[in-house]
């Protein structure tokens, strides 16, 4: 399995303003997927969102979101799926080894698969904010 | 049945500019594909000029030598892209297409659409 | 930049000869590969997409293979209506490849 480089920690307010990127980039994701008619969200995938045994900002699992967003990648070249795959990128601040993600093979899967994870990524977009948020507010108080 | 008409397409001198159009009709814009321009010149192979990603946002994608003469856009509401070009040069000359691409490899075949083309000629 | 290396840039065949076409991309496409035939004064006409998949109303005798960087086409048994030239194209939109078409492989009667 494939390791990524080590970065430096970011500061909480850099990390609030790139989920805050990604937030807003997983809206206009799901807005695209959304345009295919006919499918169905999959109870099959389920994307890894926040550990509950870590504190903000270190709580997103971001290797393996970022995992999940290159394997839609391989089955979509949407603009924004680049740019949010850069973003994860920045979140990934120790060696992390790559989650092997099975690619679904059958037309209607890979819709499936791309809109469920589409989905649950706009939802942890949304659950990382509030957790960062609130953790800030309880480190000031 | 989907096609893509180019118009716009005619004879300028060295330093002019024109639009050229590529209509959609048959299907309407919407957020499963790339509209790319594409040129051949006489006798010669064929060269991508640049994209726009018809969905949330208009992301471009041009080749190298394009930038800054080519302009890409789009009117959703004329299911029209357009293509500007300025200071245009002899070398400009060929046949302009205008084609659709998938963004997903799903069905993909349905997506891969070409119109017939609009001829440019630039010469004094 | 970028580049797509089609090989090679013309051949001659027989009906009935085996033909194979070479693509090779600078980095790593994922399989964005198209492949195309044209005739003098039309349209590219799709062969194969996504590197293996067989375009509909595409005859079987074409094929394609490849994955990463280098791509194939194969023609299985020329026929007189397969003479014209072959264009591969990478799709792969976004990152630092964009689209971008190979130079060409005209085939010619021998």
């Known amino acids: 399995s494939h390791t990524l480089p080590v970065r430096l920690l970011r500061p909480s307010d850099d990390v609030q303003k790139i989920v805050e990127e990604l937030q807003s980039l997983s809206k206009m994701l799901l807005k695209d997927v959304e345009e295919e008619k006919g499918v169905l969200v999959s109870q099959n995938y389920t994307l890894p969102c926040l550990s509950p045994d870590a504190q903000p900002p270190n709580n997103i699992h971001s290797p393996a979101i970022r995992a999940y967003l290159k394997t839609i990648r391989q089955l979509d070249n949407k603009s924004v799926i680049d740019e949010i795959i850069e973003h994860l990128d920045k979140l990934i601040f120790q060696d992390a080894p790559e989650t092997n993600i099975s690619v679904p093979t059958d037309t209607h899967e890979c819709k499936r698969f791309i809109l469920t994870i589409s989905q649950q990524f706009s939802e942890c977009m949304d659950l990382a904010l509030k957790s960062l948020t609130s953790g800030a507010q309880q480190a000031t108080t | 049945q989907s096609q893509l008409v180019e118009s716009g397409g005619g004879s300028v001198q060295p330093g002019g500019s024109l639009r050229l159009s590529c209509a959609a009709s048959g299907f309407s814009f919407s957020a499963n594909y790339w509209i790319c321009w594409v040129r051949q010149a006489p006798g010669k192979g064929l060269e991508w000029i640049v994209c726009?990603?018809?969905?949330?946002?208009?992301?471009?994608y041009y080749a190298p030598w394009a930038k800054g003469r080519f302009t890409i856009s789009k009117d959703n509401s004329k299911n029209t892209v357009y293509l500007q070009m300025n200071s245009l040069r002899a070398e400009d000359t060929a046949t302009y297409f205008c084609a659709r691409f998938s963004s997903g490899i799903y069905d993909l075949d349905r997506f891969f659409l070409w119109g017939q083309g609009t001829q440019v000629t630039v010469s004094s | 930049a970028f580049q797509l290396t089609q090989s090679p840039s013309s051949l001659s065949a027989s009906v009935g000869d085996r033909v194979t076409i070479t693509c090779q991309a600078s980095q790593s496409i994922d399989s964005w590969l198209a492949w195309y035939q044209q005739k003098p004064g039309k349209p590219p006409k799709l062969l194969i997409y996504q590197a293996s998949k067989l375009a509909s109303g595409v005859p079987s005798r074409f094929s394609g293979s490849g994955s990463g960087t280098d791509y194939t086409l194969t023609i299985s048994s020329l026929q007189p209506e397969d003479f014209a030239t072959y264009y591969c194209q990478t799709y792969y939109g976004g990152g630092h490849i964009g689209w971008g078409f190979g130079t060409g492989t005209k085939v010619t009667v021998k």
């Open positions: 726009i990603y018809i969905g949330s946002r208009a992301d471009t």
